[in-house]
Interface confidence: low
């Protein structure tokens, strides 16, 4: 019979022969022959292969280096890589999450629009009229100015985007 030019899924062509690929979590030790099956071996404890393959070496699990602010989010298996994420208060610098940076704080006059996550930084917004923020924070939103009227007081000093209004007693007309 004619030697095959293409093989089925989960097979590969070698020496004019279709051999079975190794399953995820295993590496190739020796190709099949006319008389023997493909020989595969499981990956070591700190290694993985996530596809049907003919690799002779497994990949090393990713190292979540605490010196870069990283920690293990999900430990790797023989079929999956380790997934890293950032420590509390930090976020990844890239989609691959190879290192972390400290969450940005919103300066006075700005409030937090969206709190940072392990993969995204803090989003700040300027405090609109009627709101203020007097702190640098990665969590605090803009606060509304105090309503002097509801306290039977009057505005003695107008608020800004960085300061609250100052309320004071109403001037009473003397008899």
């Amino acid at each position: 019979p004619e030697p095959p030019t293409a093989c089925r899924e989960k097979q590969y062509l070698i020496n004019s022969q279709c051999c079975s690929l190794c399953q995820p979590g295993q590496k190739l030790v020796s190709d099949c022959t006319e008389f023997t099956e493909t020989e595969c071996l499981p990956c070591g404890e700190s290694e993985f292969l996530d596809t049907w393959n003919r690799e002779t070496h497994c990949h090393q699990h990713k190292y979540c280096d605490p010196n870069l602010g990283l920690r293990v989010q999900q430990k790797g298996t023989s079929e999956t890589d380790t997934i890293c994420t950032c420590e509390e208060g930090w976020h990844c610098t890239s989609e691959a999450c190879e290192s972390c940076v400290l969450h940005r704080s919103c300066s006075p006059g700005f409030g937090v629009k969206q709190i940072a996550t392990g993969v995204s930084d803090t989003i700040c917004e300027p405090c609109p009229v009627g709101f203020f923020s007097n702190v640098s924070s990665a969590f605090e939103k803009c606060h509304p100015w105090t309503s002097c009227e509801t306290k039977d007081l009057v505005v003695q000093q107008a608020g800004t985007n960085k300061t609250d209004v100052v309320c004071g007693p109403q001037d009473r007309l003397r008899a």
Epitope: E45, S46, Q60, P66, N67, R71, V72, K75, E87, E88
Partner: antibody, heavy 121, light 106 residues
């Protein structure tokens, strides 16, 4: 042979200072994070501090934060622990330990013989 | 702060299997390692990354870690295995040790 040799321990009064050193040999010192771990008499192991391979990242146990400083001189293959405002509860054997490297996942694979620090008046 | 809990002592007869546990909240999500310390000596790493053995450590030492518990298993325990054993993990940029377990070989 991979070796860590600590020195600098001794008797010091409460409130005093001390500097411990750890001389490393037999491996590429600048490639590995290093740690200090202590053990009070009759007690278990207590982590003190860790420094990354370049010296740019440092970590401390809450019990020593603000009082102890870890540092390293990669040109001298030496790790240091500067201890200030010492207290009686700092009395212990202090071990220098090498972090296991890229795929050891936060384990200390080589330890020194330890140096004894006694804080007493 | 994160804590790791170990039994203070475990006893085993020579040739039997000894199991030492280490418990911590979601410890299985972290990598655990184990140290052996004999009286008057420095600690020695016996298991890292949950179940890996450094070179020179006998095959009778093995480890596992899932859920809230990491376990050090010593099969065919020998008199020379009598020592204190400590588990350790990284948690939020700090190293945490268990309180230690004294293994007595009867």
């Amino acid at each position: 042979e991979v070796q860590l040799v600590e020195s600098g321990g001794g008797l010091v009064q409460p409130g005093g200072s001390l500097r411990l050193s750890c001389a490393a040999s037999g491996f590429t010192f600048s490639s590995y994070a290093m740690s200090w771990v202590r053990q009070a008499p009759g007690r278990g192991l207590e982590w003190v501090s860790t420094i990354n391979n370049s010296g740019g990242g440092t970590y401390y146990a809450d019990s020593v934060k603000g009082r102890f400083t870890i540092s390293r001189d990669n040109s001298k293959n030496t790790l240091y622990l500067h201890m200030n405002s010492l207290r009686a509860e700092d009395t212990a054997v202090y071990y220098c330990a090498k972090e296991g490297g890229k795929y050891y996942y936060y384990a200390m694979d080589v330890w020194g013989q330890g140096t004894t620090v006694t804080v007493s008046s | 702060s994160y804590e790791l809990t170990q039994p203070p002592s475990v006893s085993v007869s020579p040739g039997q299997t000894a199991s030492i546990t280490c418990s911590g909240d979601k410890l299985g999500d972290k990598y655990a390692c184990w140290y052996q310390q004999k009286p008057g000596q420095s600690p020695v790493l016996v298991i890292y990354q949950d179940s890996r053995r450094p070179s020179g450590i006998p095959e009778r030492f093995s480890g596992s870690n899932s859920g809230n518990t990491a376990t050090l298993t010593i099969s065919g325990t020998q008199a020379m295995d009598e020592a204190d054993y400590y588990c350790q993990a990284w948690a939020s940029s700090t190293v945490v040790f268990g309180g230690g377990t004294k293994l007595t070989v009867l």
